[in-house]
Interface confidence: medium
């Protein structure tokens, strides 16, 4: 039987150019998390794998950081980053837990001023 | 409006504590997400710890164990307690809400770690 929930950053708004941390913690289970991965609506952003540890899939290298924690740091947005992202927690012997997150990604005429920054 | 507004800084000794506040106001939901950065002079601004709603919590490598985050959800308010501080966390701190974005960011608030 599934107990575990899935808390994510939520919907969140961002502005062109910045940076934008996506997080998800797994709670109310004892399963033992063996992977986590991130998507895009239908495409492969990174996994961070129990054993293995961080991949992140060649086109979005540039722009995506691994962290903090299992969460993943998007930087240099762009409008076409708007969308959905799924947190997909793959675990034993529950199964798959997925949390949601939407962003928005806002054009501006101060994004010069936006959020950029780096996780150590 | 949406403001963020940290207070608590000051100048404190190696191995002493402050606590940072920040006070979110101007939205109608309490954030699902808040966080605190900070930048040193010359560098880049970084992530330091983040909060979610129900509790859950990050850090940095360099302030586990030293800094605790946390948030009180009934008053928009999130908290940094600093404790064991030393001369490299010197730095101006920013709190941000819902993934770190935050635009325009606030004053932030200067902790200097210094005998």
């Known amino acids: 039987m599934m107990t575990g929930t899935i808390e994510t950053t939520g919907n969140i708004s961002a502005e062109k150019g910045g940076s934008i941390i996506l997080q998800c913690h797994l709670s109310s289970t004892t399963a033992q998390v063996t992977q986590v991965n991130w998507e895009q609506q239908d495409q492969l952003l990174a996994i961070c794998n129990a054993d293995l540890g961080w991949h992140i899939s060649p086109s979005f290298k540039d722009r995506v950081a691994p962290g903090p924690g299992l969460g993943l740091t998007l930087q240099s947005l762009t409008v076409n980053d708007t969308g959905e992202y799924f947190c997909i927690y793959h675990t034993y012997p529950d199964g798959t837990y997925t949390g949601r997150i939407f962003l928005e990604v806002l054009e501006s005429s101060v994004a010069e001023h936006g959020a950029r920054f780096q996780i150590p | 409006e949406v403001q963020l507004v940290e207070s608590g800084g000051g100048l404190v000794q190696p191995g002493g504590s402050l606590r940072l506040s920040c006070a979110a106001s101007?939205?109608?939901?309490?954030?699902?997400?808040m966080g605190w950065f900070r930048q040193a002079p010359g560098k880049e601004r970084e992530w330091v710890a983040s909060?979610?709603?129900?509790?859950?919590?990050w850090y940095a490598d360099s302030v586990k164990g030293r800094f605790t985050i946390s948030a009180d959800n009934s008053k928009n308010t999130a908290y940094l307690q600093m404790n064991s501080l030393k001369p490299e966390d010197t730095a101006v701190y920013y709190c941000?809400?819902?993934?770190?974005?935050?635009?325009?960011w606030g004053q932030g608030t200067l902790v200097t770690v210094s005998s």
């Open positions: 909060v979610l709603r129900g509790g859950y919590t």
């Open positions: 101007g939205f109608t939901f309490s954030p699902s997400w």
């Open positions: 941000a809400k819902d993934g770190g974005w935050f635009d325009p």
